[in-house]
Structure formats: structure tokens, C-alpha cells
Amino acid sequence: DAHKSEVAHRFKDLGEENFKALVLIAFAQYLQQCPFEDHVKLVNEVTEFAKTCVADESAENCDKSLHTLFGDKLCTVATLRETYGEMADCCAKQEPERNECFLQHKDDNPNLPRLVRPEVDVMCTAFHDNEETFLKKYLYEIARRHPYFYAPELLFFAKRYKAAFTECCQAADKAACLLPKLDELRDEGKASSAKQRLKCASLQKFGERAFKAWAVARLSQRFPKAEFAEVSKLVTDLTKVHTECCHGDLLECADDRADLAKYICENQDSISSKLKECCEKPLLEKSHCIAEVENDEMPADLPSLAADFVESKDVCKNYAEAKDVFLGMFLYEYARRHPDYSVVLLLRLAKTYETTLEKCCAAADPHECYAKVFDEFKPLVEEPQNLIKQNCELFEQLGEYKFQNALLVRYTKKVPQVSTPTLVEVSRNLGKVGSKCCKHPEAKRMPCAEDYLSVVLNQLCVLHEKTPVSDRVTKCCTESLVNRRPCFSALEVDETYVPKEFNAETFTFHADICTLSEKERQIKKQTALVELVKHKPKATKEQLKAVMDDFAAFVEKCCKADDKETCFAEEGKKLVAASQAALGL
């Protein structure tokens, strides 16, 4: 359905408000360092231009692609070379190379100040003074810090953000009303960003086939009553949506996502019995709700998988005729029967099945060769089951903070070359798997835990890709998307690592630690723990525990002291000396 003017088409489909918001997100995700005011100016110019195209689709430049229009607009930024360096070279390229160039320069860890939350009264005043600017600033700040944030979902977050201020700024106790809501949005936002980052990495690093396989498995678990043809259609449409969003085509992405939600709701009888409530909601809530909907119940009498995929004499014929369709059917059938498995496990099973067929269908007696393929699945299933069981036991024994510390030590020993902030961030997130998933019954633990770990390990991979320092990380991140977690789990202590030189400054603390939130204080302590392990990778758990206990006692003591700074200076020296002795440094 070709349109004379793509920009007019999208403006009409999305409406002015969403159009402006999505263009702002797109620009902020590309030019992450540009001031808010500059972006607003660019967005307004694009919007005015779009309106002229709506009025007359044949007007000058209205036939240009969105990439051309947006790219041209971005390239008018005067300070491009000073601010972005070599990204300015993108502007010398033609589309589609120019857009690809912009995409390659997206920074997962931009050098931006941490977002500090102002006082509630200050925020409420700003909200009331200029609601539109206030909400635009939210979109801008999130988008520039999360350049792969799922744009239509960010519109949903902004809607909730607005609702929180609308409600709470009128409340008797504004802070009690607003702060929990903002905390929730922040945490959900970080999780949403990380999940989308994995989808984009899957598409960009491993290709459409990898993403489609993931989508087949996940949608088959979610919609086990849907026919394979229906699931395939949803997968094709979902792949288009995410390819667009990951490629910076945010207007098309949001438009297509709305179409997909509409299709799902119009066909819910043949998709899932769980969609009714979602489909009664307005568009943004509806799309979010569908994306999070619980798994439907499995059909009652699903036949044995072995009949069609192992016992049948037609396996190799079916495989040869349409390999990806046959493997897709296998994945669909396996996934709809196993909501208790993680998506990555299902993909490992499908890969094992594929490898077996590739080998066996060329053998003298194919059936004899592949007859035991399902036996090969057993160890693949047991490995994550056992790992989750052990780690949930450890989590229940230690609690979240100490469980995070155990992971910090484990991962620092595996990949000590990785920067300390990255190790702290990733290990803290890995540790959250405990409180997130261990509370679930057995049947829900694996999909919760292993698919969450895939998201967190992808954070490590994208951060490491920016400044690669470890061949082991590169290997685990690039060899196989579905085997990343087993690859990292299998890493032992890096024996090639030369311990870091001891630097007393790293272990020098000041009174400011006392005023930090509990979370920030934990991060300080965990940063020290990573540095300790980097200095002494052979340190035992007991040694590290002793030092960390002493450190906690030291902080507690000095924060209670009258002269905190003197206490930190004097007691700190003693602690460093005692720690060096304890660790044999």
C-alpha cells in the first residue's frame, strides 16, 4: 500500500500528539547529547512540514522517505562534529547507509549525568506550569539514555507518568502518592529497556531468523490454542514491528504495532481466551497488556510429539521440503506443550533437533539415526533446572544483597578485565533473579529465571561491545544467542589474569557515604568488593566475607561517630592494612 507521502501517511495514522512524541524519541535516541531545546525545535520543524504534506501530498519533498527527511534534519545540527565526532561523517553518506551509520553510533552507555529527582513540589510546579514541556522532557531524558527503548511502549510510560502527576499533585501528601509511582515507573522502565535491547541485539547481531525463532517459541507458549498458521502470522508481524523500532523507524513501528494489536483483538477467538480484558483498553494500554498477557491454558489432548517428529518415516522428507517451516512447527509444538521451559531452552532443543536431522537425513538409515533424538534433550533440560534450584537455595539462604555479592565474586573471577561499574551493574541485576523468580512454583521458575538472565547478560554484552576487554566475554556473547547463559555459567576462574595493582585510593571512603540511600551504599560496598577480587582473584569466600564484614562494621561505626570524616580517615587506614593482611596482599 504505497502512499504518495510517507510522512503524511504516518501523521494521519498516528495523530499529531503521537507523531511529535515519536519524532522526539527518534531524534533523542540518535543525537543523545543534544540539548532538549534543540530537539524540540527540530521536532516542531518536522511537524510543520508533515502538516504541509497532509494538506497536499504532492508538495515539495513530501515524497521523500522518512529516513531522508529525518536524516536531513539531524544533519542540520550545527555542533554535530564538535559534539559527536565521527558521527558527523554519517551526514556525507546517502540513504540507506546514512541511517545505518547513525544506528551504529547509538551509545548504550552515554556519558550523561545521572537523573536526579527534584523535590516533589518542584516537580508538581513544573508539571502545572507547562505540562506539555514537562512530558516531552521525560520522553527526551529516557530516550537519550536508552537509545533502543521500545518507542510505542515509551508513549505508554509517558501516559502513566502524566497520570501519576495529575493524580498526586492534587493529593494531600504529594510525596507519599507520587514517589512510589515514580519508583515503579523507573524500575519497570529499566526492565522494559533491557528487554527491548535484547530483541534489537537478537535482530541486529543474529538476524531475523533468530528473532523469529524466539517469537515462535514465546508466542506458542502464550497462545497454545492458536494454530501454527496463526502463530506464524503473528510472528511475521511482530518481527516487522521490532525490526522497524530497532532500525529507528519509529513511526512505522508504532503504526504497525497498533495494527497488530487491532488484528489480535479482532481474532482473539482463534488466538487466546486471555485477551478479553486487554482488548477492552485504549490503544497504548491494550498493546502493553497484550505484550504481557498470561499464557493461555494448553489444549486438553495434545498428541505425542514423537509421532510426527521422531517416529514418522516422513521426517526427512518434511524437513527437506521446507526446513524452516518444519523446524518452526517443531518449535511451536514443543513450546505450546512446555510453558514450564525457558524460551532459550526451547531454542536449544530446536537447535539440537535441527543438528540431528542435518546429520541423520544424510545417513544410510535416517530413522535409526534420529530415533533417540529426544533422549539428547534430557541433559539440556536438566542443566538449567539444576542451576536454578541451586541458585534459589543460595538466594533463600543469603538474601538479595549477599546473593548479589556472591555473584559479584563469581563473575569478577570469571571475567576480571570487565570494568568495575559494569560488573557491579550486571551482577546486581543477575542477583535480582532471586527475588523476581525464586518465589514462583517450579513450573514458572525456569521461564522467569533463564529468560531474565538472557536479558541481563545481553546488557553485559552490549556494554562490553563498546569497549571490548575480554576475549571470553566476546566469545560467550557472539557464538550463540541461546547459549550465552550456559557459556557464562561454564566459565571458571580466569587463570591468565594478572591481578590489579593495589591502590589505597580505591578503598578510601568519606563521610558522604553516610548520607547515601541504602541502595547507593550497597553499590559503594559492592564496588569495593569487585576491586578486592581484582586485586586478589584467588581470595576465598571466607576471606572476602571477613573483609566485607569488617568494612560494613567500619562504615556503620564511622557514620555514628561525631567526627565522621576523621573516623573515616583513621579507621579507613587501619581497615586497609587489616584487609591487606587478611588477604595476603
Epitope: 498428541p303 510426527d308 521422531v310 518434511n318 509444538e333
Partner: antibody, heavy 121, light 110 residues
Framework: EVQLVESGGGLVQPGGSLRLSCAAS????????MGWVRQAPGKCLEYIGI???????YYASWAKGRFTISRDNSKNTVYLQMNSLRAEDTATYFC???????????????WGQGTLVTVSS | IQMTQSPSSLSASVGDRVTITCQSS????????LSWYQQKPGQPPKLLIY???DLASGVPSRFSGSGSGTDFTLTISSLQPEDFATYYC???????????FGCGTKLTVL
């Protein structure tokens, strides 16, 4: 009682279409492959095709393109859609349950009584 | 794929030993995917033998099957009055699309 009952047969004009149904009772269709076989008056049995438990379909070369087998496990029913019918398609159509689940072994151990299809102008 | 049955018709008496043969134009799957059926007028076929020699449930032991590859035999050791009917062989091949029936052997009273 374990049985298969075909329905949907009758008189149809050449070039017309017909959908036959085969309803199972006393057992679940989802555990076996289900085939269709036909027999022209006074003639041999002729294999049409089969649908496996997972919905894979296999057709005799002559039936490919004109005939389509499908199943609805929730209704415990298998179907045979016949298009572009010709006079030589006049026959009794049987549905039958194969011993296997995923393919055709040629060993059909439960048969329906059949439904007569007459193609004539 | 052709399934050739011989003879196409046969007359015999109660108590006789009867043999019917079936030859396929290529080897059946696993060398043994061959079935035998009995059909009486106005009725659907009834499975007698599967996998060349295995007796189907409820079938009297006077029926037996043998053979491998392309050549198969159905034997009725002692003909009973209820055995007069048409007998068909059916072969399963390497593809489920190729399943084929023979054209039958009509067994009548001598």
C-alpha cells in the same frame, strides 16, 4: 462404542465441491493418523491421503491439489474437502484410523461405514 | 507404485488351505510395512494382518502373513464359511503419500 461415522456425501455436479466429515466417538482422534480411502462401485480400494496427529498431511499424487484433509481435534472430527469433482470421483469414501500417529503405515484398523459421493450432471 | 495381487479371483472349499500373493513394484518401508484386509459386500474393509506377519486384534489364527521387501503372502490354513470375501493387500512406502492398495483377490465357494 468406538466408531467412525462419515457424512456429507451425496449428488454433486461435475466441477462442484463437497466436504465430507468423519466423526469419531469412543476415542480421541488426536492419538492416531486418520486416512481417507475410496472405492468406486465394484472397483478396488484407492488411497487418498492421511493427516497425522500433528496435522501433517500426505496425499496420493492424483489427489494432490484437488483434495484437502483437515482435522478439528476439539470436535473429534476429520474432514475431506473435494474440489473440481469429476464423474470418475464417484465412489464410496471411507475414513479410517491408522495404527501410526505420525505417518501412514497402510494398516488402517478402524473404518467408518463410508459415504457415497455421486458426481453427475 | 503398483501393488499386484494374484490371483485376481480364486474358488476354494471349506477346509482348504488358501494362499494369496502380493507383489510391490518397490520395497515397502522397513521391508515389512505390508497389510492385508478382508472386505465383504456392503461393508468396509477389515484389517487382518499388519507389518507383513502380525495378526490384528480379534483375527482368528488360521490367517497368517509372510514375506519381505517386495513379495508377500496371505495364507488361510483352513477355510471357514465366513472367509469367502475379497482380500486386499496395502503397502506403506518411504513416503506416506505413496501408500497403495492392491486390486483385490475375490475368494468364492467352489
Amino acid at each position: 462404542e468406538v466408531q467412525l461415522v462419515e457424512s456429507g456425501g451425496g449428488l454433486v455436479q461435475p466441477g462442484g465441491s463437497l466436504r465430507l466429515s468423519c466423526a469419531a466417538s469412543g476415542f480421541s482422534l488426536s492419538s492416531n493418523a486418520m486416512g481417507w480411502v475410496r472405492q468406486a462401485p465394484g472397483k478396488c480400494l484407492e488411497y487418498i491421503g492421511i493427516i497425522s496427529v500433528g496435522g501433517f498431511t500426505y496425499y496420493a499424487s492424483w489427489a494432490k491439489g484437488r483434495f484437502t484433509i483437515s482435522r478439528d481435534n476439539s470436535k473429534n472430527t476429520v474432514y475431506l474437502q473435494m474440489n473440481s469433482l469429476r464423474a470418475e470421483d464417484t465412489a464410496t469414501y471411507f475414513c479410517a484410523r491408522d495404527r501410526h500417529g505420525g505417518d501412514s503405515s497402510g494398516a488402517f484398523y478402524l473404518w467408518g461405514q463410508g459415504t457415497l459421493v455421486t458426481v453427475s450432471s | 507404485i503398483q501393488m499386484t495381487q494374484s490371483p485376481s479371483s480364486l474358488s476354494a472349499s471349506v477346509g482348504d488351505r488358501v494362499t494369496i500373493t502380493c507383489q510391490s513394484s518397490e520395497s515397502v518401508y522397513s521391508n515389512n510395512q505390508l497389510s492385508w484386509y478382508q472386505q465383504k459386500p456392503g461393508q468396509p474393509p477389515k484389517l487382518l494382518i499388519y507389518d507383513a506377519s502380525d495378526l490384528a486384534s480379534g483375527v482368528p489364527s488360521r490367517f497368517s502373513g509372510s514375506g519381505s521387501g517386495t513379495d508377500f503372502t496371505l495364507t488361510i490354513s483352513s477355510l471357514q464359511p465366513e472367509d469367502f470375501a475379497t482380500y486386499y493387500c496395502a503397502g506403506g512406502f518411504s513416503s506416506s503419500s505413496d501408500t497403495a492398495f492392491g486390486c483385490g483377490t475375490k475368494l468364492t465357494v467352489l
